[in-house]
């Protein structure tokens, strides 16, 4: 729980809890903002990413995003809110452990987003189907 | 019964360095994951540092990287954070706690101390 000594809400700035009501710790991210990557054509990356931080917020989740166009390849490493868009995109698999990348229509680049809840889960980027959850065998072992 | 006792606060001018400690009693310290977390006034909580353990890996918010280190003593049940290069927006109240996942998925047990005042003013 929050320690009595510690003030509640100032300015608005709430203390984010859980359902407990115990005081919601930041988790740790990745986060390099954007670099050149050589990842391409591969079932899952790391992200070549040193820089681990603690999010500034407890509510933020870890996101990466993987732009390809004529000239290079980049992926972006950060902390974001996932009630706020990220590039214009709402962040749909915040909950995730792991950082599945999902392909987002973007004009003039392949555009690959991904978000999850895990420390550091955006070092491994995943593009590989088989852990797509729109794949129905996975679904199946998910609610089994 | 758990404690945590913080002290090294004070006033220091802008550029100024200072150590803070605190000083843990009551659980098996070098077990633990530590923070040190603080609260700007009229503020809410910014996680500042994290050190594991075992192993010791440290982490620290984009804020204070490259000007504060986050150690830990496990034979004097001690952490501590060494704050160089401080500046005006560095002034809180600096807490540590520490946290322990409860064995119940995506849950933690936490304890704080009762914090100590840093001054960043000249």
């Known amino acids: 729980t929050i320690p009595p000594h510690v003030q509640k809400s100032v300015n608005n700035d709430m203390i984010v809890t859980d359902n407990n009501g115990a005081v919601k710790f930041p988790q740790l991210c990745k986060f390099c903002d954007v670099r050149f990557s050589t990842c391409d054509n591969q079932k899952s990356c790391m992200s070549n990413c040193s820089i681990t931080s603690i999010c500034e917020k407890p509510q933020e989740v870890c996101v990466a995003v993987w732009r390809k166009n004529d000239e290079n390849i980049t992926l972006e490493t950060v902390c974001h809110d996932p009630k706020l868009p990220y590039h214009d995109f709402i962040l749909e698999d915040a909950a995730s452990p792991k950082c599945i990348m999902k392909e987002k229509k973007k004009p003039g680049e392949t555009f690959f987003m991904c978000s999850c809840s895990s420390d550091e889960c955006n070092d491994n980027i995943i593009f590989s189907e088989e852990y797509n959850t729109s794949n129905p065998d996975l679904l199946l072992v998910i609610f089994q | 019964e758990v404690q945590l006792l913080e002290s090294g606060g004070g006033l220091v001018q802008p550029g100024g360095s200072l150590r803070l400690s605190c000083a843990a009693s009551?659980?098996?310290?070098?077990?633990?994951q530590m923070w040190w977390v603080r609260q700007a006034p009229g503020k809410g909580l910014e996680f500042i540092s994290?050190?594991?353990?075992?192993?010791?890996?440290?982490y620290y918010a984009n804020s204070v990287k490259g000007r504060f280190t986050i150690s830990r003593d496990n034979s004097k049940n001690t952490l501590y954070l060494q704050m160089n290069s401080l500046r005006a927006e560095d002034t809180a109240v600096y807490y540590c706690?520490?946290?322990?996942?409860?064995?119940?998925?995506?849950?933690?047990?936490?304890?704080w101390g009762q914090g100590t005042l840093v001054t960043v003013s000249s």
């Open positions: 994290r050190i594991d353990s075992p192993g010791g890996r440290t």
């Open positions: 009551g659980f098996t310290f070098g077990t633990e």
């Open positions: 706690a520490k946290r322990r996942p409860t064995g119940v998925s995506g849950t933690f047990y936490d304890y």
